[in-house]
Interface confidence: medium
C-alpha cells in the first residue's frame, strides 16, 4: 500500500499509503468512490493550524480538487510540535462527474502557521470508473 511520491518540500514526508496502490504502479482513483490517503510526516515547525491544499493536473490542465476539507487538524491531533512525527488519514469522496484521465498528477500540500509542513507529488494516478 506504500506509494512512491516526489517530495516538493524538504523531505518531511516519511511515507504515503494508499489502499490498493503500490510503489510506482498506476494508482487508480475511482469516480464516485472514496479515495483514502495516509501520510506520515515530521513537523518542521510548531504550529496550531494545519491546512490541506490539493491540486490535480488532468491531461495538463491544473484544477482545484473539489470537496476537500482544508482543515488538516480534523484528521490528526493538533497542535503540531516541531520534530514530532504525525500520521494523517484523509478520505476524499471522488465526484461521480470527475473527468476520466490516464494522465493525472496530484499535488498534496500541508501548510502550517509558518509555511509548508509537507508536500508530495504523485505522478502515476489515473481517474477511471
Amino acid at each position: 500500500d506504500q506509494v512512491d511520491v516526489k517530495d516538493c518540500a524538504n523531505h518531511e514526508i516519511k511515507k504515503v499509503l494508499v489502499p490498493g496502490c503500490h510503489g510506482s504502479e498506476p494508482c487508480i482513483i475511482h469516480r464516485g468512490k472514496p479515495f483514502q490517503l495516509e501520510a506520515v510526516f515530521e513537523a518542521n515547525q510548531n504550529t496550531k493550524t494545519a491546512k490541506i491544499e490539493i491540486k490535480a493536473s488532468i491531461d495538463g490542465l491544473e484544477v482545484d480538487v473539489p470537496g476537500i476539507d482544508p482543515n488538516a487538524c480534523h484528521y490528526m491531533k493538533c497542535p503540531l510540535v516541531k520534530g514530532q512525527q504525525y500520521d494523517i488519514k484523509y478520505t476524499w469522496n471522488v465526484p461521480k462527474i470527475a473527468p476520466k484521465s490516464e494522465n493525472v498528477v496530484v499535488t498534496v500540500k500541508v501548510m502550517g502557521d509558518d509555511g509548508v509542513l509537507a508536500c508530495a507529488i504523485a505522478t502515476h494516478a489515473k481517474i477511471r470508473d
Epitope: K48, H74, Y75, P79, V81, Y90, T91
Partner: antibody
C-alpha cells in the same frame, strides 16, 4: 497519570477579585490550549474559556465575558484565570484542563487538581 | 449553544452488572468529512478531577479499561460499562467537542447496590 498543578483554595469577599494558577509540566505547554472549567455542586461542568499560551490567543464562553480573564506565562508554563466582581454564584471548584489545538480536538485529556473558590462575607 | 442531555441522572447496580447511560445532543455532532462524532465521556470520582475515558464517541483513551465502551452517532450516544467494578462508582459526564462554547451534560451518577 500527569496532572496540572493548581493553586490552593481561596476564600474571598463579595465584590473582590481572585487569581488562580495552573502549572503544566514539560515544554508542550505552549502548543496546547489551556481551558478553564467551572463546577458547582448540582450544576455540572461549565466551560469558561481557553488560552493558547504560544501566542496568548483566547476564546471565552459568552456567559463568562467580563467575569473571567485568562492569561499565561510561557516562561513558567503557568496559566491563570482571574475572576472579578465576585458573588456567591462564583463559588465553585475551578479546573484547568489541556486540549489539543486542532479545530475539533477540543476534548480535555489532562486535568488540573482543582481550586475551590468560596465567596463569603 | 449545543445542549447536552444525559439520562438517567443516577443508576444503582451490583458489581458485575452491565450498565448503559445515554447522552443526547441538540444538534448533530457528526463531521460529514471524516465521519467522526465529536463527543467525549469523562469519569469523575468523589473529590477528584474528571478523567477522560472516550473521545470521538468511541475511541478509548490510553489506559482506560476495555470494559468502557462508547457508541452512537449524530445526536444519540451511549456509554456502556460491560461489567461494573467497585472502582467505577463515580459521576459520568458527556461533552461535545464539536463547537464552542464547549458544553457538558449534567451527568449520570453510578452508585453500587
Amino acid at each position: 497519570q500527569v496532572q496540572l498543578q493548581q493553586s490552593g483554595p481561596e476564600l474571598v469577599k463579595p465584590g473582590a477579585s481572585v487569581k488562580i494558577s495552573c502549572k503544566a509540566p514539560g515544554n508542550a505547554f505552549s502548543y496546547s490550549w489551556m481551558n478553564w472549567v467551572k463546577q458547582r455542586p448540582g450544576k455540572g461542568l461549565e466551560w469558561v474559556g481557553r488560552i493558547y499560551p504560544g501566542d496568548g490567543d483566547t476564546n471565552y464562553n459568552g456567559k463568562f465575558m467580563g467575569k473571567a480573564t485568562l492569561t499565561a506565562d510561557k516562561s513558567s508554563n503557568t496559566a491563570y484565570i482571574q475572576l472579578s466582581s465576585l458573588t456567591s454564584e462564583d463559588s465553585a471548584v475551578y479546573f484547568c484542563a489541556r486540549s489539543g489545538g486542532g479545530t475539533l480536538y477540543w476534548y480535555f485529556d489532562v486535568w488540573g487538581t482543582g481550586t475551590t473558590v468560596t465567596v463569603s462575607s | 449553544d449545543i445542549v447536552m442531555t444525559q439520562s438517567p441522572s443516577s443508576l444503582a447496580l451490583s458489581v458485575g452488572q452491565k450498565v448503559t447511560m445515554n447522552c443526547r445532543s441538540s444538534q448533530s455532532l457528526l463531521n460529514s468529512f471524516n465521519q467522526k462524532n465529536y463527543l467525549a465521556w469523562f469519569q469523575q470520582k468523589p473529590g477528584q478531577s474528571p478523567r477522560l475515558l472516550i473521545y470521538f464517541a468511541s475511541t478509548r483513551e490510553s489506559g482506560v479499561p476495555d470494559r468502557f465502551i462508547g457508541s452512537g452517532s449524530g445526536t444519540d450516544f451511549t456509554l456502556t460499562i460491560s461489567s461494573v467494578q467497585a472502582e467505577d462508582l463515580a459521576d459520568y459526564f458527556c461533552q461535545q467537542h464539536y463547537n464552542t462554547p464547549l458544553t457538558f451534560g449534567a451527568g449520570t451518577t453510578l452508585e453500587l447496590k
